[in-house]
């Protein structure tokens, strides 16, 4: 499958060769499920598509960063 | 070579639902969203939604939340739109597209021939 | 949602005429902007996407370029096989929206 585009329900099998921009995800999850082949990132786009990416990667780390900074609540 | 081949044209009464249905052939069915844009005649396009073959995982224009249904037929590489609750504004032109396989991107490179629905009572 | 304001609604030129269509955004969307062609009775075929490349098989007549909320798209020398409607298309944010489109004629 091109770039890894359809991420399925649960597992990813493989993985997006190419680096997505971060004003283009909206979201984020991890795959650690034993049954999966694989642990990966499921990201969200803002157009609601979904892409398998890998957690070892920096650009990866980085978006994932960025988008828990965003959806941080400020503290009081 | 790629190919989106839609059903023909239908008539239908208000009130009645309709489903257009879309076959690919050239390329890997579930590699690609498969998108569904209407143009009612002699007016411009208007985008309905996607779906995701691979996973049957669906996106709809809030316009059409409640009366569209997309779906796949992944063994004969066939998606399905179905419209419910026609009324006489829905009479256009149903388009099948295929959504290049960019994450964050959307266009359409392949278009299916249109299909024209005809909502009179 | 983004609404996308093409201009002119309709424009008559002569073959060998440079032809110029303008796209407004009503916000910000980068180069998120596609431009596609239509001929009578036919499915749109896609001719710039990332407001400025040329898909493959276009001829090099063709041409798109802009940012932000201002787009524009360019056909250098007008063929005859030109006259069509074409239509700009965001994906800067969902619902994907398109222009209303613009309708050329030759003279």
């Known amino acids: 499958q091109p770039d890894a585009i359809n991420a399925p329900v649960t597992c990813c099998y493989n993985f997006t060769n190419r680096k997505i921009s971060v004003q283009r995800l909206a979201s984020y999850r991890r795959i650690t499920s034993s049954k999966c082949p694989k642990e990966a990132v499921i990201f969200k786009t803002i157009v609601a598509k979904e892409i398998c990416a890998d957690p070892k990667q920096k650009w990866v780390q980085d978006s994932m960063d960025h988008l828990d900074k965003q959806t941080q609540t400020p503290k009081t | 070579q790629v190919q989106l081949v839609q059903s023909g044209a239908e008539v239908k009464k208000p009130g009645a639902s309709v489903k257009v249905s879309c076959k690919a052939s050239?390329?890997?069915?579930?590699?690609?969203?498969l998108h569904w844009v209407r143009q009612a005649p002699g007016q411009g396009l208007e985008w309905m939604g996607w779906i995701n073959p691979y996973n049957d995982g669906t996106n709809y224009a809030q316009k059409f939340q409640g009366r569209v249904t997309m779906t796949r037929d992944t063994s004969i590489s066939t998606a399905y739109m179905e419209l419910s609750r026609l009324r006489s504004d829905d009479t256009a032109v149903y388009y099948c597209?295929?959504?290049?396989?960019?994450?964050?991107?959307?266009?359409?490179?392949?278009w299916g021939q249109g299909t024209l629905v005809t909502v009179s009572s | 949602d983004i609404q996308m304001t093409q201009s002119p609604s309709s424009l008559s030129a002569s073959v060998g005429d440079r032809v110029t269509i303008t796209c407004q955004a009503s916000q910000d969307i980068t180069t998120y902007l596609n431009w596609y062609q239509q001929k009578p009775g036919k499915a749109p075929k896609l001719l710039i996407y990332d407001a400025s490349n040329l898909e493959t098989g276009v001829p090099s007549r063709f041409s798109g370029s802009g940012s932000g909320t201002d787009f524009t798209f360019t056909i250098s020398s007008l063929q005859p096989e030109d006259i069509a409607t074409y239509y700009c298309?965001?994906?800067?944010?969902?619902?994907?929206?398109f222009g209303q489109g613009t309708r050329l004629e030759i003279k």
């Open positions: 298309q965001q994906y800067d944010n969902l619902p994907i929206t």
């Open positions: 050239g390329y890997t069915f579930t590699g690609y969203y």
């Open positions: 597209a295929r959504d290049i396989a960019a994450a964050g991107a959307v266009y359409f490179d392949y």
